[in-house]
Interface confidence: medium
């Protein structure tokens, strides 16, 4: 397993609708054709997998139908969007990139993007 540099923004603020987007960029040392991208969430020293997708270079990322993630790829960049976030989902979201094929296998893990989610204030009842 060989190491690979992965860059991602330090901080992102989710929208009022609970959507956060960030770019995950990897320094590809070879001509990878099959790439796997995994988003991990670290909170309270626990790491959980948020979503994962494998894509062939030049193709779209395909997450599972019930995934909260969507994404697009362009060269060595992956544009990730996480939906349905609430305040309790605030945490460090780490981008993990694996160059699956052809060998040699490369693994890169970013430093993480701190995503802040603020639940919108409920609309006050209004009398008409």
């Amino acid at each position: 397993c060989k190491a690979m540099h992965v860059a991602q923004p330090a901080v992102v603020l989710a929208s009022s609708r609970g959507i956060a987007s960030f770019v995950c960029e990897y320094a590809s040392p070879g001509k990878a054709t099959e790439v796997r991208v995994t988003v991990l969430r670290q909170a309270d020293s626990q790491v959980t997998e948020v979503c994962a997708a494998t894509y062939m270079m030049g193709n779209e990322l395909t997450f599972l139908d019930d995934s909260i993630c969507t994404g697009t790829s362009s060269g060595n960049q992956v544009n990730l969007t996480i939906q349905g976030l609430r305040a309790m989902d605030t945490g460090l979201y780490i981008c993990k990139v694996e160059l699956m094929y052809p060998p040699p296998y490369y693994l890169g893990i970013g430093n993480g993007t701190q995503i802040y989610v603020i639940d919108p204030e409920p609309c006050p009842d209004s009398d008409f």
Epitope: C1, T33, E34, R36, M57, G58, Y101, P102, P103
Partner: antibody, heavy 122, light 111 residues
């Protein structure tokens, strides 16, 4: 269903070249690597190399670098292997095979053509 | 290049008994996550057929009497109980690195 179609046989003169074809159907050709494997009569399997139709990237075993050239034609979903300067040592069955997604299968070849038997004889 | 050594070269097994085929790599073909070893069956005049991938995963449509195990450098293919249609040559193949290599093959005969 996935199919890799190869001609049954080729008869070639020593010193000549031959271009073997592998016509793919039943899947997205540009998404999967195609491998080529040699099998001499009564012998085992030898990996020649592979090619990725999506980007024309290819790899070869060192001993086949000057013998084989791998190409693809994405418009017809076909992979080709040209063998040059043929000798009796090149008489063999040549298979093309599809590499299953590495993430799922780890480098196994899930579909194979029936092979082309190449006979080098004057 | 990694060399794969299969043993035995040939094997005669009675119907209903167990056939065990070994494949040894000259260096590890495993990582912390996967064992990059696969098994194929080839009958005369036919192309190889994938039986087991990643050391122990049964390919779709392959009978459950076929099983694979092992990690690192030592891998095993078991067939139990052996049936007449299992008479064939079996090959191991590695994919940890390029070039891919195959074992020399084991010819299984049923008596």
């Amino acid at each position: 269903q996935v199919q890799l179609q190869q001609p049954g046989s080729e008869l070639v003169r020593p010193g000549a070249s031959v271009k073997l074809s592998c016509k793919a159907s039943g899947y997205t050709f540009t998404n999967y690597w195609v491998h080529w494997v040699k099998q001499r009569p009564g012998q085992g399997l030898e990996w020649i190399g592979n090619i990725f139709p999506g980007s024309d990237t290819s790899n070869y075993d060192e001993k086949f670098i000057s013998k084989a050239t791998l190409t693809v034609d994405t418009s017809s979903s076909a992979a080709y292997m040209q063998l040059n300067s043929l000798t009796s040592e090149d008489s063999a069955v040549y298979y093309c095979a599809r590499l299953a997604y590495f993430t799922n299968y780890g480098g196994a070849m899930d579909y194979w053509g029936r092979g082309t038997s190449v006979t080098v004889s004057s | 290049d990694i060399v794969l050594t299969q043993s035995p070269a040939s094997l005669v097994v009675s119907l209903g008994q167990r056939a065990t085929i070994s494949c040894r790599a000259s260096k590890s073909v495993s990582t912390s996550a996967y064992n990059y070893m696969h098994w194929y069956q080839q009958k005369p005049g036919q192309p190889p057929k994938l039986l087991i991938y990643l050391a122990s995963n049964l390919e779709s449509g392959v009978p459950a009497r076929f099983s694979g195990s092992g990690s690192g450098t030592d891998f095993t293919l078991n067939v139990h109980p052996v049936e007449e249609e299992d008479a064939a040559t079996y090959y191991c193949q590695l994919s940890r690195e390029l070039p891919y290599t195959f074992g020399g093959g084991t010819k299984l005969e049923i008596k």
